[in-house]
């Protein structure tokens, strides 16, 4: 098989047929050494998946459904370009399965139960696999056959293509549960009237049908969404309260060697050739042969999906978790509502020491799952593989952006026993410098630089945040001459600096030595010039505070803070002299799990926080010799939010407008999988 | 630092038991959290069984109703009882008592166990 040629699955003799004449066509417009077709057929799409798996074939579009088995081993495929809908400049690549009710009603999510139900069909998406994936643990035993069970549930329902003669109560609402528009309730529009009409009391749809079959926002009102929490919002609000993100049409490839760069660069190529309205030979999205060939008609163009997203993440906790309930029929033994083991996410194996010391003493209420980034480990957390971590506000930001919550802020400064119920308002961002340097604010430009990571508040945030508004560009490891920036690119500058040990240096995690507050701060004692870390970290490395060997002996007068208006102060006027207020790092954990969080750890705070005097003898959760492992070391305790339970909130309309403005200097993948 | 020494280690069949030791040189009494981990070739360093000063225990899922943890601080000695063992079980396990491993990574010599029929 020639390197550039891309064999396309097809899975008939009409998608075959079309799979020919676009590589003819395509071998028309593309130049000789640019990427070719070549098309493989097979007799159904799950041969396909097998077929890519096993390298006898490259790339298929699939739905949602489909994807799923993709990415289940053995197959392990990926998502690598989507399909989109709507226009160019509004591109939807996904829809919102959503529990629609009327607004009059008075139940929520968990109060189903005896309702009356409208379904678009028997098996379909968002009327049916989401909604009662999503339900299946609260079924009544036993749970096959689904349809008996479901019957159960509801009190009475609207199914089209449901048996109507064995589950009849699956077509009380629509007698014969027709399988085509003859049948009043079928489908998305048909499951709509259902509730409108007072026939059923919830409706499982997608979140565009409540605009479809009602243009009148005044009309719209008289509807709410279901969500997962046990609320309710607005139909606007689909975003923020729907049962499933789904994502519409996909092209998936091998996880490994799956040729993604070489599929987008045919693909890009081809909606410039022949996507809508572009020819009139040959079309991308339509076909004389027959509806939806190896593109959905509707489609309007492609979308690479960015490099970090995974399948997990493509399809969504809530889609796998439904998916994986019907398919595999498996529930908890313990009650939906009680609160399993929180699951912690551990950067690298120091903080996956720590936990596994925590889960032993939390009696096994605290698991452990470690990551070696950041990143990864919010990409556990939304997956499901975890529940919980404490977070710098920079990473607040992008799980807030990847859908997770805050649950409970570090505290710092509040004595107990006040200090679980105050809202404190942040620390100091400060550029520290030797004191017998001659530098300043403004002369930074050359200098050797230290930062605690890419993406971290005090460390990068904050400090390149105001660096970008005076040099207007995001190349800051040609500002600095050379500095360890811990997730920098390998290769830059910022890379430069930092201590490894080898395979892990300017790693993001405590394997490099000079990760962190302590880290910078180490890196400004052993080789910088200055250091961007938060006000505590120079008193509480100097004065023999940390008996390391390279800190033991230092004193704090030989250090001093940067002022943004060219002064220079003590290190014990971090209110006179720093670079912004910085908010507190902050636990955060997937809607679903918050409260469970904040009640276990307000729980194991009370047995192993800040009041446990013995730190030799006695587990401590916020202690670790300066190395700040699973929470800061100067933590107080874990404080309520109140109602600031979201990360806008959390962080506070200022620091998000300045992150917001770093973004295009962003090097998160995480960040991009998510605004995807 | 208190140094640990595992011994116990040996080739067993599986559904067999083996009883491994750990033995502190200096008082484990003054320790708190005392842990079995493993290492099977090729894999991350997992925790097997943990115990506390006050007898609280925790168990991975892999071991649970298989594995038993205990302590007595008079002989500053940490067991771990291993019965219905299974071939998944060979690695190398190790002691340890926390204070020293999560800041210089500091790690005994182990005993290996073989499950093998």
């Known amino acids: 098989v020639p390197e550039k040629s891309v064999r396309w699955c097809a899975v008939s003799e009409h998608e075959a047929t079309k799979c020919q004449s676009f590589r003819d066509h395509m071998k028309s417009v593309l130049p000789s050494n640019g990427p070719s077709v070549a098309c493989v057929k097979k007799a159904s799409h799950l041969d396909c998946i097998r077929a890519i798996a096993a390298n006898e074939a490259d790339a298929v579009t699939l739905d949602a459904g489909l994807v799923y088995d993709a990415y289940l081993a053995p197959n392990n495929l990926k998502p690598v370009v989507a399909e989109f809908y709507g226009s160019k400049e509004d591109p939807q690549t996904f829809y919102y399965a959503v529990a629609v009710v009327k607004k009059d009603s008075d139940f929520q999510m968990n109060q189903l139960r005896g309702r009356k139900s409208c379904h678009t069909g028997l098996g379909r998406s968002a009327g049916w696999n989401i909604p009662i994936g999503l339900l299946y643990c609260d079924l009544p035993e036993p749970r096959k056959p689904l349809e008996k069970a479901v019957a159960n549930f509801f009190s009475g329902s609207c199914v089209p293509c449901a048996d109507g003669t064995d589950f009849p109560q699956l077509c009380q609402l629509c007698p014969g549960c027709g399988c085509s528009t003859l049948n009043q309730y079928f489908s998305y529009s048909g499951a709509f009237k259902c509730l409108k009409d007072g026939a059923g009391d919830v409706a499982f749809v997608k979140h565009s049908t409540i605009f479809e079959n009602l243009a009148n926002k005044a009309d719209r009102d008289q509807y709410e969404l279901l969500c997962l929490d046990n609320t309710r919002k607005s139909v606007d609000e689909y975003k923020d309260c729907h049962l499933a993100r789904v994502p519409s049409h996909t092209v998936v490839a091998r996880s490994v060697g799956g040729k993604e760069d070489l599929i987008w660069e045919l693909l890009n190529q081809a909606q410039e050739h022949f996507g809508k309205d572009k020819s009139k030979e040959f079309q991308l999205f339509s076909s004389p042969h027959g509806k939806d060939l190896l593109f959905k008609d509707s489609a309007h163009g492609f979308l690479k999906v960015p490099p970090r997203m995974d399948a997990k993440m493509y399809l969504g906790y809530e889609y796998i978790t439904a998916i994986r309930n019907l398919r595999e029929g498996t529930c908890p033994e313990a009650p939906t509502d009680e609160c399993k083991p929180v699951k912690w996410c551990a950067l690298s194996h120091h903080e996956r020491l720590k936990c596994d010391e925590w889960s032993v003493n939390s009696a096994g209420k605290i698991e452990c799952e470690s990551a070696e980034t950041t990143e990864d480990c919010i990409a556990k957390i939304m997956n499901g593989e975890a529940d919980a971590m404490s977070l710098d506000g920079g990473f607040v930001y992008i799980a807030g952006m990847c859908g997770l919550v805050p649950v409970l802020a570090e505290n710092y400064n509040t004595p107990n026993p006040n200090c679980e119920n105050t809202a404190e308002e942040g620390y100091f961002a400060v550029a520290v410098v030797k004191s017998s340097s001659d530098l300043t604010w403004d002369n930074l430009k050359g200098k050797k630089s230290c930062h605690t990571a890419v993406g971290r508040t005090a460390g990068w945030n904050i400090p390149m945040g105001l660096l970008y508004s005076k040099i207007n560009h995001c190349r800051f490891d040609e500002f600095f001459s050379e500095g360890c920036a811990p997730g920098s690119e390998k290769n830059s500058s910022l890379c430069k600096l930092c201590m490894g040990p080898s395979p892990n240096l300017c790693e993001p995690n405590n394997k490099e030595g000079y990760y962190g507050y302590t880290g910078a701060f180490r890196c400004l004692v052993e080789k910088g010039d200055v250091a961007f870390v938060k006000h505590q970290t120079v008193p509480q490395n100097t004065g023999g505070k940390n008996p390391d060997a390279w800190a033991k002996n230092l004193k704090e007068e030989d250090y001093e803070l940067l002022c943004l208006d060219g002064s220079r102060k003590s290190v014990q006027e971090p209110a006179n002299c720093h670079l912004a207020r910085a908010p507190n790092h902050a636990v955060v954990a997937r809607k679903d799990k918050a409260d469970c969080v904040q009640t276990l750890l307000l729980d194991q705070q009370r047995m192993f926080g800040s009041s446990v005097t013995d730190c030799s003898s006695n587990f401590c959760l916020f202690e670790s010799k300066t190395k700040d492992l699973l929470f800061r070391d100067d933590t107080v305790c874990l404080a309520k939010l109140h109602d600031r339970n979201t990360y806008e909130k959390y962080l506070g309309e200022e620091y998000v407008k300045a992150v917001t403005n770093l973004r295009k200097c962003s090097t998160s993948p995480l960040l991009e999988a998510c605004t995807f | 630092q208190v140094q640990l020494v595992e011994s116990g280690g040996g080739l067993v069949q599986p559904g067999g038991s083996l009883r491994l030791s750990c033995a502190a040189s200096?008082?484990?009494?003054?320790?708190?959290?005392m842990a079995w981990y493993r290492q099977a070739p090729g894999k991350q360093r997992e925790l097997v069984a943990g115990?506390?000063?006050?007898?609280?225990?925790t168990y991975a899922g892999s071991v649970k109703g298989r594995f038993t943890i205990s302590r007595d601080n008079a002989k500053n000695t940490v067991y771990l009882q291993m019965n219905g063992l299974k071939p998944e079980d060979t690695a190398v396990y190790y002691c340890t008592d926390y204070s020293s491993s999560y800041y210089q990574d500091y790690w005994g010599q182990g005993t290996q166990v073989t499950v093998s029929s």
């Open positions: 200096g008082s484990i009494f003054s320790i708190n959290t």
């Open positions: 115990i506390t000063r006050s007898g609280t225990t």
